[in-house]
């Protein structure tokens, strides 16, 4: 199945030419997408070519400047933010990284009123993260650690927190594990839907044992970077939940919100929160075990001042077959009755889709059923009840956005995404405006990506937001590989995989074969998406065959797939790849003397296992910072599918699992590790135990570091990393320079 | 009636301890953030320590840090005040008061702490 | 820490006059975060008007505060024989809550 749009050939086959790395490396390939910044029904904020930043209302069609570019280059604004009540816009500057999705900035407020700065009682700098309140202009900002409340941006500043430590305490912001494996944000703060309340965690990360690496830099000395981050099987962050009356706070003061007593009774985390009015708010807490989800609805407590959590209100959400949720456990959707809510978990059937809570879970009336998965509930509104699932067409790969009206009976359903352009767009999100007015669909593929707005009620398209036709006219010229996606049927398991292919494909000829993998647990690799990246260049130019298989652990397919690998991680995700290149084998267009596979992360932890599996089947392989023990990574996410590395729980797995276990093995493959010195999320610790262990065996290897590089080997880095794997998988195919 | 009750004042040496009490009544205590403030004679107030409602955080004025703790038992509805190495200057009528930082709506009758040799 | 000062130090009036009394923050207060207290001789302090420039609970509407900033004022529109007592502004926006150094209101 062809899954790239074909495109009508230039007669002169000399005016195509292949890819290039340069190509790949400059990103002359890359799209665009366009997210509006809805600030109600029917407007939204866009940042223009020219960095004006542009209000759009989209029933008078009319568009004006609230920023002009002259006033964001006057602080170097590389982001912005306008308050609710429309006086004033944030401007950050100064961006500094810290972890994947934290980061401190400067920021500026300036007042559209007046056309001017506020100033007297500016912001302290560097910030960690900041927010306008829902409603009117309040603003809630973490500075070293500590949360402030500012009534009106030129007022001083209220401090709710004093406890904030460097390292220590973490107030309305994640540590490390947190962020990471847990929020996924860079905030741990939130406001009641009207501004009248602030709900923010505090994570004590005092007894948490510290990862301690060298930073180079250019000084004389190195300096040390220290994180708590807590291993699997260490002490793990305790946190805890406030909330402020941001009226007058400096009254009642930040009350805590109790912890369910069934998850209290032992280690737990906290897992989201979501507002459901101004004076409900929902938590979910997970336990350490993280099979078990409660699901708490708390209510404000006028007359005491207090949140009232009753045990009335806890939802409980087990897995008996794996753990709890998919990646992370799934969070509510509040309906407008706001005490019943929608959920994706999974039915009896072991597949996930939307239920709809109205007293208890196990009363949850299933409102998407099927051999496919719900994926993601983007809205619910008085009638209407948006998400996308995998359902159209049995293919797990792709993302259709389905409407549900919630207001008739029976409720019917709507595929809004499928025949929209059918062969370009079979992988969606989407945006919505308040009251689901109005959306934003944004297609990733298989074709040329393509940003849409629609109208919420009729879902007829109104304008095309992004199609790019330049990128389309860039590629008129290119001679792209031939991309398609299908399954194979091994043991009653279906191991759906993409296959990458060269311009010219023959198949009565033999190509060099390259696995991609990443293969953790609740990912997907095969997904109908567009992308011109290193493995396009490897087909298009080298001449190479590129897969991509989703074995056992990969999501979306059910949780007889998904959850095979609990307590057993790096076994079946390498035998699935394994049995994949033995299927693509027989095919009969693979050279079974060239074969490769190479992987990142988790990726790199699987890639090493298959290369070590004895099979005889990889000529060579690239691991590029990947884990080699369970041991060493954190525990959120290890323990999740790991369980403890104890004696009475799950240690002889986690020492049977590592990577150095099987150093002999590599006696017979070329295998070339690869690892950034300043890795934050894998530490450089893994690589340095396998090259240890590669050692001690006298297995030979190759090896490349990147000084002072984290997880994603970012900047020039990515330029010398892609050309040397290049390199590298070249001489091992014995393909020319 | 929000009553406020405080206790365990009296003369002591410098250097000494002391333990104040203050047993509220009338109202949900586990619910508030509670405060002791001072009054040294014929002066004015000065705010002393804070405790918020659940007794996760607790704030201190620079003169007592690192002498006076503040604690609290909801289930007895009784806030505390642990001073040791007390000097002649903590001499003062010492009030508990419902509220955290500002706007205290209800505070007891006060107890006195002499601290002299 | 912000200092209070209060002023006049002592008020001089008869009952039935109106009283006003100022309060100078040394930095930016605003009114969500000063309260006014009242309190007479041998007992506790009594709220009057709560941050927010609320009147507190059963205190008679004579009272008002106004003010933002830096600059607060109590008003006492006619005071009663009962108001002759030490008026004290508090602020709860920054660490430590602070008091200012008192207003006495005397009967002239």
């Known amino acids: 199945i062809v899954l790239r749009p074909s495109r009508v050939h230039n007669s002169e086959e000399n005016t195509m030419r292949a890819l290039t790395l340069k190509d790949i490396l400059n990103g002359t390939f890359s799209y665009k997408t366009f997210f509006p910044n809805w600030i109600s029904g029917q407007e939204y904020l866009h940042q223009s070519a020219d960095n004006n930043i542009v209000l759009y209302n989209i029933e008078t069609g009319q568009s004006y400047t609230i920023l002009s570019n002259r006033t964001m280059k006057s602080v170097n604004a590389s982001n912005y933010g306008l308050s609710p009540d429309r006086q004033f816009v944030y401007l950050e500057s100064d961006y500094s990284k810290l972890w994947r999705y934290s980061y401190t900035a400067t920021y500026y407020i300036y007042d559209l009123s007046n056309g001017e700065f506020v100033r007297g009682n500016e912001l302290p700098r560097p910030i960690q993260y900041l927010c306008w309140s829902p409603v009117g202009s309040k603003l809630a900002y973490v500075y070293q650690n500590n949360i402030y409340l500012k009534q009106r941006p030129g007022d001083p500043p209220f401090q709710i927190t004093f406890n904030g430590r460097e390292n220590k305490i973490f107030n309305g912001i994640p540590d490390w594990v947190y962020e990471e494996e847990m929020l996924a944000t860079k905030y741990a703060l939130w406001w009641s839907p009207n501004g009248k309340f602030l709900a923010y965690a505090e994570f004590n990360d005092t007894d948490i044992p510290v990862i301690a690496y060298s930073y180079y830099g250019d000084e004389q000395y190195p300096r040390t970077i220290n994180i708590p981050y807590p291993k699997a099987g260490a002490k793990n962050p305790v946190v805890r939940i406030f909330i402020i009356d941001t009226t007058y706070p400096a009254y009642v003061g930040p009350q805590e919100v109790p912890v369910p007593a069934m998850i209290a009774s032992s280690d737990y985390y906290f897992s989201w929160l979501t507002w459901v009015t101004d004076e409900r708010v929902c938590l979910q807490w997970l336990k350490r075990v993280q099979n078990v989800s409660v699901l708490s609805i708390c209510d404000f407590r006028e007359d005491w001042q207090t949140w009232d959590c009753p045990k009335t209100q806890e939802h409980i959400e087990e897995s008996r077959t794996g753990w709890a949720g998919g990646f992370f456990v799934s969070t509510p959707v509040f309906s407008y009755d706001a005490i019943s809510y929608y959920k994706i978990f999974s039915d009896k059937d072991g597949y996930k889709h939307i239920h709809y809570i109205k007293d208890t879970v196990e009363n949850a009336i299933q409102i998407t059923s099927g051999k496919w998965e719900a994926i993601n509930i983007f809205r619910v509104t008085q009638d209407s009840l948006f998400y996308s699932s995998n359902e159209f067409e049995e293919y797990p790969g792709r993302r259709n956005i389905y409407r549900i009206s919630i207001g008739s009976y029976p409720p019917s359903k709507k595929c809004v995404t499928c025949h929209l352009r059918k062969e370009r767009c079979q992988y969606y999100t989407a945006s919505f405006s308040d009251y689901a007015k109005y959306y934003a669909l944004v297609c990733y593929g298989p074709g040329i990506p393509i940003s849409t707005l629609h109208d919420g009620r009729t879902d007829q398209e109104i304008k095309i937001l992004e199609e790019n036709k330049e990128l389309e006219n860039a590629l008129k010229n290119i001679q792209l590989p031939k991309e398609e996606i299908k399954k194979l049927e091994v043991d009653e398991i279906t191991l759906w995989y993409k296959m990458i292919l060269p311009p010219q494909f023959d198949r009565s000829k033999k190509y060099p074969l390259l696995i991609q993998v990443y293969g953790g647990p609740c990912s997907q690799s095969v997904r109908s998406v567009f992308a011109v990246n290193w493995i396009s260049y490897l087909a298009s130019k080298e001449g190479m065959v590129i897969a991509l298989v989703d074995g056992r652990g990969t999501a979306f397919q059910g949780d007889k797939l998904l959850y095979a690998v609990y307590r057993k991680l790096g076994v079946y995700e390498v035998e699935d790849q394994i049995t994949a290149v033995r299927k693509f084998i027989e095919m009969g267009f693979i050279d079974e003397k060239r074969i490769a596979i190479w992987g990142w992360s988790y990726g790199g932890y699987v890639s090493s296992l298959a290369l070590a599996s004895g099979t005889g089947l990889f000529k060579c392989g690239i691991a590029v910072a990947p884990v080699s023990s369970w041991e060493y990574y954190a525990s959120v996410y290890t323990e999740r599918f790991m369980g403890l590395p104890t004696k009475d729980d799950n240690l002889e797995h986690y020492k049977n699992s590592t990577v150095m276990a099987r150093a002999e093995y590599f006696r017979n493959v070329d295998y070339l590790l690869i690892h950034g010195t300043a890795d934050d999320n894998v530490h450089f610790q893994n690589s340095a135990q396998i090259a240890k262990a590669l050692v001690n065996a006298q297995v030979d290897f190759q090896a490349m570091w990147y000084s002072d590089q984290n997880h994603g080997l970012s900047g020039l880095s990515t330029n010398h990393l892609y050309t040397h794997m290049t390199h590298f998988l070249k001489q091992c195919f014995s393909l020319s320079d | 009636e929000v009553q406020l009750l405080e206790s365990g004042g009296g003369l002591v040496q410098p250097g000494g301890s002391l333990r104040l009490s203050c047993a509220a009544s009338?109202?949900?205590?586990?619910?508030?953030?509670m405060s002791w403030v001072r009054q040294a004679p014929g002066k004015g107030l000065e705010w002393v320590s804070a405790?918020?409602?659940?007794?996760?955080?607790?704030y201190y004025a620079d003169s007592v840090k690192g002498r006076f703790t503040i604690s609290r038992d909801n289930s007895k509805n009784t806030l505390y005040l642990q001073m040791n190495s007390l000097r002649a200057e903590d001499t003062a009528v010492y009030y508990c008061?419902?509220?955290?930082?500002?706007?205290?709506?209800?505070w007891g009758q006060g107890t006195l702490v002499t601290v002299s040799s | 820490e912000i200092v209070l000062t209060q002023s006049p130090g002592t008020l001089s009036l008869s009952p039935g006059e109106r009283a006003t009394l100022s309060c100078r923050a040394s930095?930016?207060?605003?009114?969500?975060?000063l309260a006014w207290y009242q309190q007479k001789p041998g007992q506790a302090p009594r709220l009057l008007i709560n941050?927010?420039?609320r009147r507190a609970t059963g205190i008679p509407d004579r009272f008002s505060g106004s003010g933002s900033g830096t600059d607060f004022t109590l008003t006492i529109s006619r005071l009663e024989p009962e108001d002759f007592a030490v008026y004290y502004c508090?602020?709860?926006?920054?660490?430590?809550?602070?008091f200012g150094q008192g207003t006495k209101v005397e009967i002239k």
């Open positions: 941050v927010g420039s």
């Open positions: 405790i918020i409602s659940s007794g996760a955080s607790t």
């Open positions: 009338g109202f949900t205590f586990s619910s508030y953030a």
């Open positions: 508090q602020q709860g926006i920054m660490l430590p809550p602070t």
């Open positions: 008061a419902k509220g955290w930082f500002g706007g205290f709506n209800y």
């Open positions: 930095q930016s207060v605003t009114s969500s975060y």
